[in-house]
Amino acid sequence: ATKLTEEKYELKEGQTLDVKCDYTLEKFASSQKAWQIIRDGEMPKTLACTERPSKNSHPVQVGRIILEDYHDHGLLRVRMVNLQVEDSGLYQCVIYQPPKEPHMLFDRIRLVVTKGFSGTPGSNENSTQNVYKIPPTTTKALCPLYTSPRTVTQAPPKSTADVSTPDSEINLTNVTDIIRVPVFN
């Protein structure tokens, strides 16, 4: 099995984790994709997933997690906004490909969230606080109940993450077609 690598990210409470998970464009463009947390001694748990089939550049929000699948670019963007200390943990992007096991995208993300001042949410007319004011919509995307394996035989492309600038402007208040999905334990 391929050695699983991780990248560590130390962020402050209130900041945003912004992850790029890239994949083989032709093969996985419309496949359903998911963001998972891996807790010690447990199988990966799916926190959020895209629709099936995955829609291009179509935001899907589950609580503080926002997924966007850029089909044109072979890239899944994952954001976790307003980070909390309890969000600390190991995360990964996967591609669902039933009936086969999910396809894991390297690297895993080791997120460490610490308490502390992370700057003002933003001085622009639309600050990062607005990201939570999203109109309720019909639930469309359902995450498969099965979880992904702990190992994988081939190494797919890497994923990376970063924190948004504190004074960034994120305005999702006028987005009426964001999909909110339930979380499966």
Epitope: K20, S57, N124, L172
Partner: antibody, heavy 118, light 108 residues
Framework: EVQLVESGGGLVQPGGSLRLSCAAS????????MSWVRQAPGKGLEWVAN????????YYVDSVKGRFTISRDNAKNSLYLQMNSLRAEDTAVYYC???????????WGQGTMVTVSS | DIQMTQSPSTLSASVGDRVTITCRAS??????LAWYQQKPGKAPKLLIY???SLESGVPSRFSGSGSGTEFTLTISSLQPDDFATYYC??????????FGGGTKVEIK
């Protein structure tokens, strides 16, 4: 042909304002993030701001926050940079660039010169 | 923000030389690095993306390598058209982007 053409540069006094435009053609403008990058005379490249496809996210370099505003009009295939409270250090060639998340800045305009001087 | 350090700032070389430019990131950027070429009075041109992928239309004498924090741009056999300034840029997240300070490749 994929093309970006900037306009709106010129000479402006410190504290003044200027609005740069970038006309896009040859590709689906509404499918791409877009960026502004500047280059002061004899200096290196500095990323200034970028904007998501639908305009819902905008990011700025620290030195222009609160003074510059990036915007777009997808119906007109146009990108804009409103620059207020201009300073001498904002003097530069301003480039509009297509922002492809896998590739980086893969298409650039020819640039427009902004000179801030009294 | 992620800082990008490029070296050398100036490089004197002759046609046919093998040229290597390095770029170091202040933190891991995986493979999210691009290299650009810029000639005086012109806009930058994308050469390499994802650290090692050659942009369409770029001559194969250009190559990129590295991941994490250390990256290299190599020109296997310098041609007259290659005398220019080269910049690295990280695009690990959707913002902010940062460029290296540039490397001017001049005629020896």
């Amino acid at each position: 042909e994929v093309q970006l053409v900037e306009s709106g540069g010129g000479l402006v006094q410190p504290g003044g304002s200027l609005r740069l435009s970038c006309a896009a053609s040859g590709f689906t403008f509404s499918s791409y993030w877009m960026s502004w990058v500047r280059q002061a005379p004899g200096k290196g490249l500095e990323w200034v701001a970028n904007i998501k496809q639908d305009g819902s996210e905008k990011y700025y370099v620290d030195s222009v926050k609160g003074r510059f505003t990036i915007s777009r009009d997808n119906a007109k295939n146009s990108l804009y940079l409103q620059m207020n409270s201009l300073r001498a250090e904002d003097t530069a060639v301003y480039y509009c660039a297509r922002d492809a998340p896998q590739l980086g800045l893969d298409v650039w305009g020819q640039g427009t010169m902004v000179t801030v001087s009294s | 923000d992620i800082q990008m350090t490029q070296s050398p700032s100036t490089l004197s070389a002759s046609v046919g030389d093998r040229v290597t430019i390095t770029c170091r990131a202040s933190q891991s950027i995986s493979s999210w690095l691009a290299w650009y070429q810029q000639k005086p009075g012109k806009a930058p041109k994308l050469l390499i993306y994802k650290a090692s992928s050659l942009e369409s239309g770029v001559p194969s004498r250009f190559s990129g390598s590295g991941s994490g924090t250390e990256f290299t741009l190599t020109i296997s056999s310098l041609q007259p058209d290659d005398f220019a300034t080269y910049y690295c840029q990280q695009y690990k997240s959707f913002s902010p982007f940062t460029f290296g300070g540039g490397t001017k490749v001049e005629i020896k």
